[in-house]
């Protein structure tokens, strides 16, 4: 018979800190004893339990380093069969924050929503949306990706979307929610957070609450992850640089700065296509970089670094819809 793998997908995604089992089975037609084993080509295998005709690979407390290519090799006599499974490890804890925590009708026009401690952070996997009632507001004004302060070997990100709100000046403003969705092969997970809309500026908190609670709405297809534990907050975090963007003639200006007191400097260390393609200016704790928006504009990671200390800040810019090159 064929070599059977459960789950049958060629890509299996597991949440960070979660567990997953991959089972490989083979039966031989001629009553010969089959041989089945898992091999990790580029990763440590985890725990493997094999007996005649089956092999079970168990991944517990998955970290990003558990990701990789696993091959199940089965044989019946001289016939050898193989199946490859790519294990992905993602992080998507229920850690959504919104700013402001409550909106004042007629006054607040912009809202930001941030998903914390996630990976991957690219738009194809992680989408952020703002829901007004059951209607999704259009494209975000901007999307920013920054590295979280590193805790252990796993590099995680915070992704922030910003939206401009329509007028909320109706007798009963519709409910406002921020939703984050992680989509990977075999996995679709969503978290949602309500943003209270206040009628007037008497209080920033809705009556009867201390702070708006997250309202997770978890839906998953073909996934059996254990939820990842929330990342611990470290109180004494080192001083970190931050990247700000502002529009400039013909493009964007990025400012990397660190408010860490005297004796520190920041500098740009990475940009799509190489730093030499950009105009830069550095002055102690501030460094500027000009991003032209000709054609599609650059797409990729901009990174700056703090010295001394080596802390990094990163920003991922998505290329905008292409404007055709200006006529000569």
């Amino acid at each position: 018979g064929p070599l059977e793998v459960e789950p049958p997908d060629s890509v299996v995604a597991v949440s960070m800190g979660g567990s997953r089992q991959l089972t490989c089975r083979l039966s031989c037609a001629d009553h010969r004893a089959p041989s089945v084993q898992w091999r990790g080509l580029d990763t440590s295998l985890g725990a493997v339990r094999s007996d005649a005709g089956s092999s079970v690979l168990s991944v517990h407390n998955a970290s990003l380093s558990a990701a990789g290519t696993h091959v199940c090799v089965g044989s019946c006599g001289n016939l050898t069969l193989q199946r490859t499974v790519q294990l992905l490890v993602f992080a998507f804890p229920d850690q959504l924050t919104v700013s402001p925590v409550a909106l004042v009708a007629k006054q607040d026009r912009e809202v930001a929503c941030t998903a914390h401690n996630v990976t991957p952070a690219s738009p194809e996997a992680l989408s952020l949306s703002l829901l007004l009632g059951d209607r999704e507001l259009g494209e975000a004004l901007s999307r920013e990706v920054e590295e979280e302060p590193q805790q252990g070997e796993d590099l995680l990100f915070q992704v922030t979307g910003r939206w401009l709100l329509p007028s909320l000046d109706t007798p009963t403003p519709p409910a406002l929610h921020c939703r984050a969705t992680m989509t990977l092969p075999g996995v679709q997970l969503s978290h949602q957070r309500a943003i209270p809309v206040l009628r007037s500026l008497t209080s920033r908190e809705p009556p009867g609450t201390t702070s708006p609670e997250a309202t997770p709405e978890l839906s998953s297809t073909r996934s059996s992850e254990s939820p990842a534990p929330p990342a611990g907050n470290s109180s004494a975090r080192p001083c970190r640089p931050k990247i700000h963007q502002s529009p400039a003639a013909g493009g964007l200006e990025l400012l990397c700065e660190a408010a860490c007191g005297p004796g520190v400097a920041v500098g740009w260390t990475q940009a799509p296509g190489g730093l030499e393609a950009y105009q830069r200016r550095e002055a102690g704790a501030q460094a500027w970089l000009s991003v032209p928006r000709a054609g599609c504009g650059p797409e990729g990671w901009f990174q700056c670094r703090l010295d001394p200390g080596g802390q990094m800040a990163s920003l991922y810019l998505v290329a905008e819809v292409c404007s055709p090159p200006a006529p000569p």
Epitope: T69, P120, A121, P185, Q188
Partner: antibody
Framework: QVQLQESGPGLVKPSETLSLTCTVS????????WSWIRQPAGKGLEWIGR???????NSNPSLRGRVTILADTSKNQFSLKLSSVTAADTAVYYC??????????????????WGQGTLVTVSS | DIVMTQSPDSLAVSLGERATINCKSS????????????LAWYQQKPRQPPKLLIY???IREYGVPDRFSGSGSGTDFTLTISSLQAEDVAVYFC??????????FGGGTKVEIK
């Protein structure tokens, strides 16, 4: 065994749209990422773009605006449309399965299964 | 874009001898956080599609003969065929997958028998 097979017209007129389909067997297109790659005669390989689980796409910025990649999960197929073609688009077009990984929050890939390729000539 | 440059363009080696192909990236494809190098090698025989040989710069794809090996880190990489066989006559390509979009390939190196 995973198999991919490209199909579509071998001849396209300049300024028209090139359309190709890739039929996949041995794997579900909804459980992976899938790419189109092309190779002009005697030249190197150029990644065109890919489609992924959520139905979204990435494409090569050098072709941006001309590339559309769609999936039909009911037929286990994905397709490529390349608009406004010129003679420079003459090439063997391959579909391939991405082996994806996660790095720096991105999802790059290399290619572990390829179709046999189909030659598309752009000529009037 | 990360530009991948291969050398030489072609190479003639006697059967049983060592063949060495080089690939250089315009920026580092080594990710220091996990110490992985995001580079793959492919073999393309005449009238066939490319076949994956090596990824992470040095991991052989399952079923690839052990005479093929990959090495290098950062920006300079090498594919070595330790003892060339007749069936190894092909064009070999490197590919970076550190940065997307786009994923980029080298121009190819043609290996022939001397």
């Amino acid at each position: 065994q995973v198999q991919l097979q490209e199909s579509g017209p071998g001849l396209v007129k300049p300024s028209e749209t090139l359309s190709l389909t890739c039929t996949v067997s041995g794997d579900s297109i909804s459980s992976n990422y899938w790419s189109w790659i092309r190779q002009p005669a005697g030249k190197g390989l150029e990644w065109i773009g890919r489609i992924y689980t959520s139905g979204g796409t990435n494409s090569n910025p050098s072709l941006r605006g001309r590339v559309t990649i769609l999936a039909d999960t009911s037929k286990n197929q994905f397709s490529l449309k390349l608009s406004s073609v010129t003679a420079a688009d003459t090439a063997v077009y391959y579909c391939a399965r991405d082996r994806i990984t996660i790095i720096r929050g991105l999802i790059p890939s290399f290619f572990d299964y390829w179709g046999q390729g189909t030659l598309v000539t752009v000529s009037s | 874009d990360i530009v991948m440059t291969q050398s030489p363009d072609s190479l003639a080696v006697s059967l049983g001898e060592r063949a060495t192909i080089n690939c250089k990236s315009s920026q580092s494809v080594l990710y220091s956080s996990n110490n992985k190098t995001y580079l793959a090698w492919y073999q393309q025989k005449p009238r066939q599609p490319p076949k994956l040989l090596i990824y992470w710069a040095s991991i052989r794809e399952y079923g690839v003969p052990d005479r093929f090996s990959g090495s290098g880190s950062g920006t300079d990489f090498t594919l070595t065929i330790s003892s060339l066989q007749a069936e190894d006559v092909a064009v070999y390509f490197c590919q970076q997958y550190y940065s997307i979009p786009p994923l980029t390939f080298g121009g190819g190196t043609k290996v022939e028998i001397k």
